[in-house]
């Protein structure tokens, strides 16, 4: 908790790591051959930059930021990734008809830098 202390984006509004929603069809996702429903998914994903201390997931992320400043060619900046997920249920095609299947890591719920 101590590490994740920066929620102010120094790069300006909407530029740092955040939850972003994209409306996508089954065709867009390449799922049309095995998923029947929903036909459209509001895909929530994590997008944006991870400047110093911004939503740092842990001390490792802070170290990564510091070393990236010193050695940008060697150490990459922290990445914006899901901190947790919302589950989603899909109606899928099966050999015998249709079935329900739940996925617990499909949609981002919130984001952090790691």
């Amino acid at each position: 908790a101590r590490a994740r202390n920066g929620d102010h984006c120094p790069l300006g509004p909407g530029r740092c790591c955040r939850l972003h929603t994209v409306r996508a069809s089954l065709e867009d996702l390449g799922w049309a051959d095995w998923v029947l429903s929903p036909r459209e998914v509001q895909v929530t994903m994590c997008i944006g930059a991870c400047p110093s201390r911004f939503r740092a997931a842990n001390m490792h992320a802070q170290i990564k930021t510091s070393l990236h400043r010193l050695k940008p060619d060697t150490v990459p900046a922290p990445c914006c990734v899901p901190a947790s997920y919302n589950p989603m249920v899909l109606i899928q095609k099966t050999d015998t008809g249709v079935s329900l299947q739940t996925y617990d890591d499909l949609l981002a719920k919130d984001c952090h830098c790691i």
């Epitope: 929903p38 249920v89 949609l107």
Partner: antibody, heavy 119, light 110 residues
Framework: EVQLVQSGAEVKKPGESLKISCKGS????????IGWVRQMPGKGLEWMGV????????IYSPSFQGQVTISADKSISTAYLQWSSLKASDTAMYYC????????????WGQGTLVTVSS | QSVLTQPPSVSGAPGQRVTISCSGS????????VNWYQQLPGTAPKLLIY???NRPSGVPDRFSGSKSGTSASLAITGLQAEDEADYYC??????????FGGGTKLTVLG
């Protein structure tokens, strides 16, 4: 305002057929799945099945497979639950419910339809 | 017999805090989510908590949900007379799809 309005109470005899309805309004009916839930007198909730009104794909709980039929008519934003031959043990309150966006929970419920089967 | 196990009844005095447990297994709560519904006497169920700990708009913050391992719980603080109702947990099970707990009757004393 999202609303699910169910048809009125029914009293039937064993062996008779029945079709009850659930009309959705205040939202895009084809964008959300509809589920049916049974509550027998003094008992808990039991999931019966789900339908995607846009493609009429249906999936049933193993406990209700072959016992009931779930259907929908998207032109009138209505889902249905039907029996071809009722039994006394079908006496219960039946609720339709709309699934939330991710298909994992029921965010709006109908008022329920009480079905009584008695000779 | 429900896949998810809840106590049949709990009670508390106005203003108190009560919790309702929901016990499952590794094939349901253990790997997935839990939702909670409130059913006031003579009415349809109403969504109270979804995806473990999220409240729909309009639900007071006196209601909160949590999940740990294969169990979940619903906490109600500042108990009020109008909270007297049946409460159901609901999850997903790999064999039965959507499953409910057997329900817990909450009685507000006094």
């Amino acid at each position: 305002e999202v609303q699910l309005v169910q048809s009125g109470a029914e009293v039937k005899k064993p062996g008779e057929s029945l079709k009850i309805s659930c009309k959705g309004s205040g939202y895009s009916f084809t964008s959300y799945w509809i589920g049916w839930v049974r509550q027998m007198p003094g008992k808990g909730l039991e999931w019966m099945g789900v339908i995607d009104p846009s493609g009429s794909y249906t999936i049933y709980s193993p406990s209700f497979q072959g016992q009931v039929t779930i259907s929908a008519d998207k032109s009138i934003s209505t889902a249905y639950l039907q029996w071809s031959s009722l039994k006394a043990s079908d006496t219960a309150m039946y609720y339709c419910a709309r699934y939330g966006r991710y298909g994992t929970y029921f965010d709006y419920w109908g008022q329920g339809t009480l079905v009584t089967v008695s000779s | 017999q429900s896949v998810l196990t809840q106590p049949p009844s709990v009670s508390g005095a106005p203003g108190q805090r009560v919790t309702i447990s929901c016990s499952g297994s590794s094939s349901n709560i253990g790997v997935l989510y839990v939702n909670w519904y409130q059913q006031l006497p003579g009415t349809a169920p109403k969504l109270l908590i979804y995806s473990n700990d999220n409240r729909p708009s309009g639900v007071p913050d006196r209601f909160s949900g949590s999940k740990s391992g294969t169990s979940a719980s619903l906490a109600i603080t500042g108990l009020q007379a109008e909270d007297e109702a049946d409460y159901y947990c609901q999850s997903w099970d790999s064999s039965s799809n959507y499953v409910f707990g057997g329900g817990t009757k909450l009685t507000v004393l006094g």
